[in-house]
């Protein structure tokens, strides 16, 4: 069986139609189309809830950029 020893990749079948405030977001991960039916972004909120979002939407791209910058900027 392929990749049987690897944890299964979670998939998204629907995307949220609500913009999520960046203050509520803790992290994200990308899901590629070779592993799942849809390319997706999964945001994890500060209360550890996971939400599927459409990577083609501007607010999703902006939120990823924001989280990337947060990660790159060391907190003092």
């Amino acid at each position: 069986q392929p990749d049987a020893i690897n944890a299964p990749v979670t998939c998204c079948y629907n995307f949220t139609n609500r913009k999520i405030s960046v203050q509520r977001l803790a992290s994200y991960r990308r899901i590629t189309s070779s592993k799942c039916p849809k390319e997706a972004v999964i945001f994890k909120t500060i209360v550890a809830k996971e939400i599927c979002a459409d990577p083609k939407q501007k607010w999703v791209q902006d939120s990823m950029d924001h989280l990337d910058k947060q990660t790159q900027t060391p907190k003092t």
Epitope: A7, C12, C52
Partner: nanobody
Framework: EVQLVESGGGLVQAGGSLRLSCAAS????????MGWFRQAPGKEREFVAA????????YYADSVKGRFTISRDNAKNTVYLQMNSLKPEDTAVYYC??????????????????WGQGTQVTVSS
């Protein structure tokens, strides 16, 4: 746990057709998505097609759109992959897999964690 058994693979000439079947047992499948994946020698496994058990929404990889059709028979707990206009590059081991949906519409699923043993499809030119 979900048990999946594929059948229907074989050797076919380019341009020909095959129908793969995946018989599922062990669960009530209403909250599952059933998928077909394939893995060619030396390549990564790739998504081919999927269908929601409840509602029947379908999803396809771009490489098979218009050529492959996924369907299900709820009474038989079986998912089918009708493959037409086959090409040599479709040669691979085809796997059936099951994915449990999240609790809400926008939650990610559990992932394709249950797999069949695979069935070989060879397309000769």
């Amino acid at each position: 746990e979900v048990q999946l058994v594929e059948s229907g693979g074989g050797l076919v000439q380019a341009g020909g057709s095959l129908r793969l079947s995946c018989a599922a047992s062990g669960r009530t499948f209403s909250s599952y998505v059933m998928g077909w994946f394939r893995q060619a020698p030396g390549k990564e496994r790739e998504f081919v097609a999927a269908i929601r058990w409840s509602g029947g929404s379908t999803y396809y990889a771009d490489s098979v759109k218009g050529r492959f059709t996924i369907s299900r028979d709820n009474a038989k707990n079986t998912v089918y992959l009708q493959m037409n206009s086959l090409k040599p590059e479709d040669t691979a081991v085809y796997y059936c897999a099951a994915d449990l949906l999240g609790d809400s519409d926008y939650e990610p699923s559990s992932g394709f964690g249950s797999w069949g043993q695979g069935t070989q499809v060879t397309v000769s030119s």
